[in-house]
């Protein structure tokens, strides 16, 4: 979806554990600590030191329910989220940087501490190169591992 | 193999409700979307609304906001479509529809469909 | 909602022939979009997702073309076995919307 052309269940055991509440995960990972605005991401980004995940995505968007599900329900992608500053936003913000080929959703931008926008970690979709799909959550955790790894041999 | 078994054929007056059942086997019952479509007599396919079972999440056409109710019973691997107020309008075979295997959107295995008819 | 002219309404061709189909979106709707095969008293099968990738299963001559706005259903070589109605379906924006369908006849 391009943001610039239009923005019951019974329960299992392990549903019974108790969840914080959604707020600012938005069902990404409730379990998560999820920073609430860009600066504020950046900003612990650079003094901690860890990389930053953008995850851009609309609630009335079918991809973005899609990819938030598997998301959220991979353990390892969710491990691996422990070790980043992680943001989701329903806006766009006013740094370009962050749609490098466009405002479309879902998309997942990685920035370093350094402040420099990932755009060499990409999907698998040419013509829109940080767009992510259910079927894509095995590339989406390399690409994590990737912008850590990376960061690790910046140090 | 995935199969999606529907309930029999209902007929109902106009003001009712009806709920159809979905029952699923072969597959994550709790990790693929369940679309619902309804088909009028001679007519086109019309999108209903989807549920994810695994936590309950709907989304509904606008046109079918107020009247119908997506909802899974993880402990049977069934949905149900409930819908309310019918009119003759509503006469129609009604499927559901799972998405595909990893949690994408698109439509991949269909039910048997369930045939409701509204008449006074 | 997206709207989805889907042409012709109605065709006839011989067994053999290849056959084409097209549906058109009202606005871009990336590669989200599915055919279905529906056969009288049947429920639908999907026979294409995301455009152009076949559905486990599905004969290899069908194929699905497109992106964007403009979508193509191909049958390469027409069988018995075809003879159905055929729908395209766009999954990129709520309400999911399905084209008017196209009914296909031999000869």
């Known amino acids: 979806k391009d943001t610039t052309v239009k923005s019951g269940a019974k329960k299992d055991p392990k549903d019974s554990r108790p969840k914080l509440p959604q707020t600012l995960s938005r069902g990404w990972g409730d379990q998560l600590i999820w920073t609430q605005t860009y600066e504020e991401a950046l900003y612990r980004s650079k003094t901690s030191n860890r990389p930053l995940m953008v995850i851009h995505h609309l609630d009335e968007c079918p991809h973005s329910q899609a990819l938030k599900k598997v998301f959220a329900e991979h353990k390892e992608i969710q491990k691996l989220a422990e070790q980043f500053v992680l943001l989701n936003l329903v806006y766009e913000t006013t740094d370009k940087h962050l749609s490098p080929d466009g405002q479309y959703v879902p998309r997942i931008v990685f920035v370093d501490p350094s402040l420099t926008v990932r755009a060499d970690i990409t999907g698998r979709y040419s013509n829109r190169l940080y767009a992510y799909e259910p079927s894509d959550t095995a590339l989406l955790y390399d690409n994590m591992k990737k912008a850590l790894k990376l960061l690790k041999t910046e140090l | 193999q995935v199969q999606l078994v529907q309930s029999g054929a209902e007929v109902k007056k106009p003001g009712a409700s009806v709920k159809v059942s979905c029952k699923t086997s072969g597959y994550v019952f709790s990790r693929s979307w369940m679309n619902w479509v309804r088909q009028a007599p001679g007519q086109g396919l019309e999108w209903i609304g989807w549920i994810y079972p695994g936590d309950g999440d709907t989304n509904y056409n606008g046109k079918f906001k107020d009247r119908v109710t997506l909802t899974a019973d993880k402990s049977t691997s069934t949905v149900y479509m409930e819908l309310s107020s019918l009119r003759s309008e509503d006469t129609a075979v009604y499927f559901c529809?799972?998405?595909?295997?990893?949690?994408?959107?698109?439509?991949?295995?269909w039910g048997q469909g369930t045939l409701v008819t509204v008449s006074s | 909602d997206i709207q989805m002219t889907q042409s012709p309404s109605s065709l006839s061709a011989s067994v053999g022939d290849r056959v084409t189909i097209t549906c058109k979106a009202s606005q871009d709707i990336n590669s989200y979009l599915s055919w279905f095969q529906q056969k009288p008293g049947k429920a639908p099968k999907t026979l294409i997702y995301r455009a152009n990738r076949l559905v486990d299963g599905v004969p290899s001559r069908f194929s699905g073309s497109g992106s964007g706005q403009d979508f193509t259903l191909t049958i390469s070589s027409l069988q018995p076995e075809d003879i159905a109605t055929y729908y395209c379906?766009?999954?990129?924006?709520?309400?999911?919307?399905f084209g008017g369908g196209t009914k296909v006849e031999i000869k």
């Open positions: 379906l766009q999954y990129d924006e709520f309400p999911f919307t």
């Open positions: 529809a799972r998405g595909g295997y990893d949690g994408s959107p698109w439509l991949s295995y």
